[in-house]
Interface confidence: medium
């Protein structure tokens, strides 16, 4: 049976918590990703940014979970209108920013 949206968001948040707390070496070897506008369409925008990171097992589960939230198919190299123009940040910082934003969405009761 489908997982309730609130449960799915909790699980995504917990996965991001695990990533930030279990980080020993630089996450994804210090890979850089496009920074995104967190105010709208956050799940698809985050996936469009993170999908360009390959060979990083630490975020593979996050990528799969974000895919479940995004209603359309996302592929590597896809341009997002929600990305912050010409700004790249480390995956570790991206995950931290995304985590705080998703917790705020959860606190607001916005599960979709």
């Amino acid at each position: 049976s489908p997982v309730p949206p609130s449960t799915a968001l909790k699980e995504l948040i917990e996965e991001l918590v695990n990533i930030t707390q279990n980080q020993k070496a630089p996450l994804c070897n210090g890979s850089m990703v496009w920074s995104i506008n967190l105010t709208a369409g956050v799940y698809c925008a985050a996936l469009e940014s993170l999908i360009n990171v390959s060979g990083c097992s630490a975020i593979e589960k996050t990528q799969r979970m974000l895919n479940g939230f995004c209603p359309h198919k996302v592929s590597a190299g896809q341009f997002s209108s929600l990305r912050v123009r010409d700004t790249k940040i480390e995956v570790a910082q991206f995950v931290k920013d995304l985590l705080v934003h998703l917790k705020k969405l959860f606190r607001e009761g916005q599960f979709n």
Partner: antibody
């Protein structure tokens, strides 16, 4: 400097009413959610009520719902708490508190007043 | 409504590390804030959004949050850290702010 100053506390009989006020200064009052938090003697903190920046939304603790009303006047930088049908268990120090807003949720309480004491006793 | 559980008291020797816990169902999904309150004073925000520290709060204060427990950690504890500490979250289900019961930190 940024400041919140409460007034209106005192001794009141059970069943009666009291109105608390809070004067804000040193910051853009109209851009913040405002809360009341209380603390009974020797007890922990208890959240009482919130009103959003534009006054459009209010929420209350179950213990005061239907008896207390939170209002604000952004033109005068004041926050109020109208307390009706007071009970002995409402005896506490009442703090006026500022919190940044994120849509319709409260962020951390980053500025507190010094509190005003309300005693409900016959 | 959402319930936050704190130990009533924690004792620690000066210079040691104090850990104050705040338990709640899947609290890791919530943003947790921590306040310090000394006798006769209003509370003071010491940690917000799980891990962030306001200006003027020493680096000795840190926070973490995952699973069912949030933790306030105070390293190299000083006598001046003796106070009551409260955790707090916003509960979207009831649209209410919730405080833990508070923990009295005693510096031996």
């Amino acid at each position: 400097q940024m400041q919140l100053v409460e007034s209106g506390g005192g001794v009141v009989q059970p069943g009666r009413s009291l109105r608390l006020s809070c004067a804000a200064s040193g910051f853009a009052f109209r851009t913040y959610g405002m809360h009341w938090v209380r603390q009974a003697p020797g007890k922990g903190l208890e959240w009482v009520a919130v009103i959003w920046d534009d006054g459009s939304n209010t929420h209350y603790a179950d213990s005061v719902k239907g008896r207390f009303t939170i209002t604000r006047d952004n033109s005068k930088n004041t926050l109020n708490l109208q307390m009706n049908s007071l009970r002995a268990e409402d005896t506490a120090v009442y703090y006026c508190v500022r919190a940044p807003q994120w849509y319709l949720t409260a962020e951390a309480f980053d500025l507190w007043g010094q509190g005003t004491m309300v005693t409900v006793s016959s | 409504s959402y319930v936050l559980t704190q130990p009533p008291s924690v004792s620690v020797a000066p210079g040691q590390t104090a850990r104050i816990t705040c338990g709640g169902n899947m609290i890791g999904a919530y943003l947790v804030h921590w306040y310090q309150q000394k006798p006769g004073q209003a509370p003071l925000l010491v940690i917000y959004d799980d891990v962030d520290r306001p200006d003027r709060i020493p680096e000795r204060f840190s926070g973490s949050n995952s699973g069912n427990t949030a933790t306030l950690t105070i390293s190299r504890v000083e006598a001046g850290d003796e106070a009551d500490y409260y955790c707090q979250v916003w509960d979207h289900n009831t649209q209410q702010m919730v405080f833990g019961g508070g923990t009295k930190l005693t510096v031996l």
